[in-house]
């Protein structure tokens, strides 16, 4: 077969080939940020000629052109400056309102390198309508100027811009416009991962963690899908495997889907996952009708077995057939469960379509979506039972109109996105499920994205101030209780001056809480063994503080999971009959268990908890500490089995002021507290300039560093005594 010519360079840019110079290969151009390629791609035809998709005239030289953002077409009740036909990257547009109108949205917007404006649509509103003025996004024209109940407004985009969002919106009885805000965008524009992750996550996370079977009541903030105890989520992952997707890109599709599966199974919802790859025909790798679709390892292994070569005989993009196979799956499940049953009607359905192009065979995918909406009986009341996310990757041949038509339209949410490449997709899936935004008390969720603050990464972490100074740390274990160390409180029982500082999204300094009640273990007495030559003894070094008010759950404040509770059992995805012993075996399951604690400056530091024979050799070092234990004969007099031991090799040592803080592990993207910082043989902060400076102990130090943490598995009777009506404990 003839190969295509190689004179296809783009001035100022680069290109990649999906299958070399052979027929069927897709050539994709890319340009530096702030520029876009024209044309975006070419296809090598069987004749040995390059063809530009959608082009009418003969092959033109590929060039990188400057990205521009669309200009306002009309701006009601105000003025904007400067008035240009379109705006360069970095250019600003400013909005002002006439007297009597108040500006809502962004007064100044900047054109970003992806051809999208930053900020929000500026609207000059006088508050006269039943619904607020829906505004006119940049580049759009609106018809309809009445904002009463039942009134409709319609939008279209000027010149060659593409509309995403709802072209028609209706003012609903609740004073909210139906659908989602329309945006006019350049055909070459794309979304940045940092914008997509939160937008996708906000919408998607409503479904996750919302089923917390241990919670009796639920406050619903905005749209939050309530998957009841009997409720269920079906997640359908559709992966494009057509010719234009390179094998490497398909691997990233698979990896992104795996990330998604891994994350979604880490939340306590009943979920079944379907996996469908498609090109000219769909291939169902996992059906929601298969019991294995509820098992994370089975789902991931079916994903791993997805083979790029499965579709080499039919390389078109038949999105209709892929969506239709979802419809058929739903139809079969409905017949199985019975159309009228709650079991069928209470299932929520989420479809994620990962594609790199427009469908080019099999009919309109919209038809399949209509069938799906029909079978699920999606109407205004049941709108929350279906979410379709259409994610285009590659911005070359992706059809904005089609993606927009497929994606769900829900107020304040976006369901259609175009990303620049598969790397960006991976980034989005890594960060989209930031369920730490949930308002209920789901435990052990920390934001793991790269741009999260320290407090968002460890939102259970609190600072305790018995005096004006910060003295100790602790961990939220519910919305009103903090677990910490008893030795932090050595001034008797007057806790009227004590304060607990909890993370707060509104303030970098956090929020201070008074203490209603302090429960300090009666067994704690630092001088208990003084007459045995043990000058300090930290047995039973544990305390609970009840805060004077409940903490509002947020990205910055959320409890950690305590093992041996039902809450932790759900987070570990363990079967219902699990015991405390099972949790210990799962969490402290090695001779050396990687764990973390939080430093004075809020960062997460690493340690290794030594178990079994390694625990013995870890603790043995204490016999070399002659000041605190001048005539110690048995190390176990000091290091009882209440303690976990760390501090060997490359471990960080906690400072004195980090006492009481959680020692925690990560499992399945959730965090579990197994211990609390108690005492040690070396203080890396001693005499340092500030919270950011720690000194490593010299290798020659005698005794070498060792750190001891109260083992929560050994404090169960005491924890149950005081938290029995706060947490749901499992049998021992």
């Amino acid at each position: 077969a003839p190969s295509c010519p190689q004179n296809v360079n783009i001035s100022g840019g680069t290109f990649t080939l999906s299958h070399g110079w052979a027929p069927g290969s897709l050539l994709t151009y890319s340009c530096p940020q702030g520029l876009y390629p024209s044309p975006a791609s070419r296809l090598c035809k069987s004749s040995g000629q390059w063809q530009t998709p959608g082009a009418t005239r003969s092959l033109s030289k590929a060039v990188c052109k400057p990205v521009r953002c669309p200009a306002p077409v009309s701006f009601e009740n105000g003025i904007y400056t400067p008035r240009l036909g379109s705006y360069p990257v970095g250019g600003n547009v400013s909005f002002e309102c006439e007297d009597g109108f108040i500006l809502r949205g962004s007064p100044v917007r900047q054109c970003r390198p992806n051809g999208m404006w930053d900020g929000e649509t500026a609207v000059c509103d006088n508050g006269a309508g039943h619904c607020p003025n829906p505004g006119i996004s940049l580049g759009a024209v609106r018809t309809g100027f009445r904002f009463g109940h039942g009134d409709k407004v319609r939008y279209r985009c000027s010149s060659n811009l593409v509309l995403t969002g709802s072209s028609e919106r209706e003012c609903q009885g609740n004073g909210v416009w139906s659908g989602t805000e329309p945006i006019c965008r350049q055909p070459y524009s794309y979304d940045f991962p940092e914008d997509v992750a939160p937008a996708l996550g906000t919408s998607f996370s409503h479904m996750l963690g919302a089923t917390n079977p241990t919670q009796k009541t639920k406050e619903s903030l905005g749209r939050k899908i309530q998957i009841q105890r009997s409720g269920h989520l079906n997640l359908y992952l559709l992966l494009d495997c057509s010719q234009s997707v390179s094998e490497n890109d398909f691997l990233i599709f698979k990896e992104s889907a795996s990330l998604m599966v891994d994350r979604i199974f880490s939340f306590e919802i009943n979920v079944s996952v379907a996996i469908i790859t498609f090109a000219s025909e769909p291939k169902v790798l996992m059906s929601v009708l298969n019991d294995n679709s509820r098992d994370m390892t089975e789902v991931i292994s079916s994903l791993e077995n997805a083979n790029y070569k499965d579709h080499e005989n039919g390389t078109g993009t038949n999105t209709y057939a892929a969506l239709n196979s979802v419809y058929l799956m739903m139809n079969n499940q409905m017949r199985l469960l019975g159309m009228e049953t709650m079991a069928w009607q209470e299932i929520r359905h989420a479809i994620i379509l990962l594609t790199d192009g427009k469908s080019n065979m099999g009919g309109s995918p919209k038809t399949a979506v209509d069938h799906i909406r029909e079978i699920l009986n999606i109407n205004q009341k049941r709108n929350d039972y279906l979410d379709i996310y259409a994610i285009g990757v590659g911005k070359l041949d992706v059809d904005w109109r089609e993606l927009n038509e497929l994606g769900s339209k829900k107020d304040g949410e976006r369901h259609a996105f175009i990303l620049q490449d598969t790397k960006a997709l991976h980034q989005v899936f890594e960060h989209m499920l930031d369920v730490s935004k949930l308002t209920d008390t789901i435990c052990g969720v920390g934001n793991m994205s790269a741009n999260a603050s320290d407090q968002e990464r460890t939102p259970w972490h609190v600072t305790i101030k018995p005096k004006s100074q910060e003295t100790c740390r602790g961990a939220l274990i519910s919305d009103q209780w903090v677990l910490t160390a008893a030795h932090c409180f050595r001034d008797g029982n007057d806790h009227s001056l004590w304060r607990v500082n909890v993370g707060d999204p509104k303030s970098q300094w956090g929020k201070e809480f008074l203490i209603e009640k302090a429960v300090i273990s009666p067994g704690f007495d630092v001088f208990a063994k003084k007459n045995q030559g043990i000058l300090e003894f930290y047995g039973d070094d544990i305390a609970l503080l009840k805060l004077a008010q409940k903490v509002k759950m947020s990205t910055h404040a959320r409890p950690i999971c305590l093992p041996c509770t039902m809450e932790a059992n759900l987070a570990l995805r363990r079967p219902q009959g699990s015991t405390c012993r099972d949790h210990e075996n799962e969490l402290l399951n090695k001779q050396s268990v990687p764990a973390h604690f939080v430093a004075l400056n809020g960062s997460k530091l690493n340690i290794n908890l030594k178990m079994g024979v390694e625990w013995t050799s870890c603790a043995e070092v204490v016999s070399q500490e002659k000041t605190m234990f001048p005539n110690l004969t048995d190390v176990r007099e000091v290091v009882t089995d209440q303690f976990l031991c760390s501090g060997t090799q490359e471990d960080e040592s906690p400072c004195k002021g980090e006492s009481g803080g959680a020692v925690f592990l990560e499992r399945r993207f959730r965090f579990f507290q197994v211990g609390l910082v108690s005492w040690g043989l070396y203080n890396p902060c001693l005499g340092s300039a500030d919270k950011n400076s720690r000194k490593r102990a010299p290798r020659s130090k005698v005794p070498p560093p060792r750190d001891f943490h109260i083992n929560l598995f050994r404090m169960q009777p005491w924890l149950r005594q005081h938290l029995g009506d706060v947490l749901n404990f499992l049998p021992l």
Partner: nanobody, 122 residues
Framework: QVQLVESGGGLVQPGGSLRLSCSAS????????MGWFRQAPGKEREFVAA????????EYADSVKGRFTISRDNSKNTLYLQMNSLRAEDTAVYYC???????????????WGQGTLVTVSS
């Protein structure tokens, strides 16, 4: 907050000894970690020694280990620093400090004495 007053500084020959005292007002002395810092002319303030609130554990800077001993008497609300084998480089103003957490971070310490000068010279 604890009020602190140091005493016992003075001029001493190399190899000589000196005992510094720091008396604290306030009934909460016994619940504070106590420490000594020093500042030589033109230099940063540096950590010398610390003792836990129980008196059970002590820590020393490498430069004074084996020569200086920190101790406390909770019944007298007093902290001590016994300095032996003094050297010229020990010349500095010595400050007593109280810290509830025990980390003695220079940025956070709010209880300092006014200092006592120790000069080691022949």
């Amino acid at each position: 907050q604890v009020q602190l007053v140091e005493s016992g500084g003075g001029l001493v020959q190399p190899g000589g000894s000196l005992r510094l005292s720091c008396s604290a007002s306030g009934h909460t002395f016994r619940s504070y970690y106590m420490g000594w810092f020093r500042q030589a002319p033109g230099k940063e303030r540096e950590f010398v020694a610390a003792i836990s609130w129980t008196g059970g554990s002590t820590e020393y800077a490498d430069s004074v280990k084996g020569r200086f001993t920190i101790s406390r008497d909770n019944s007298k609300n007093t902290l001590y620093l016994q300095m032996n084998s003094l050297r010229a480089e020990d010349t500095a103003v010595y400050y007593c400090a109280a810290d509830y957490s025990g980390d003695f971070l220079l940025s956070d310490l709010d209880s300092w004495g006014q200092g006592t000068l120790v000069t080691v010279s022949s």
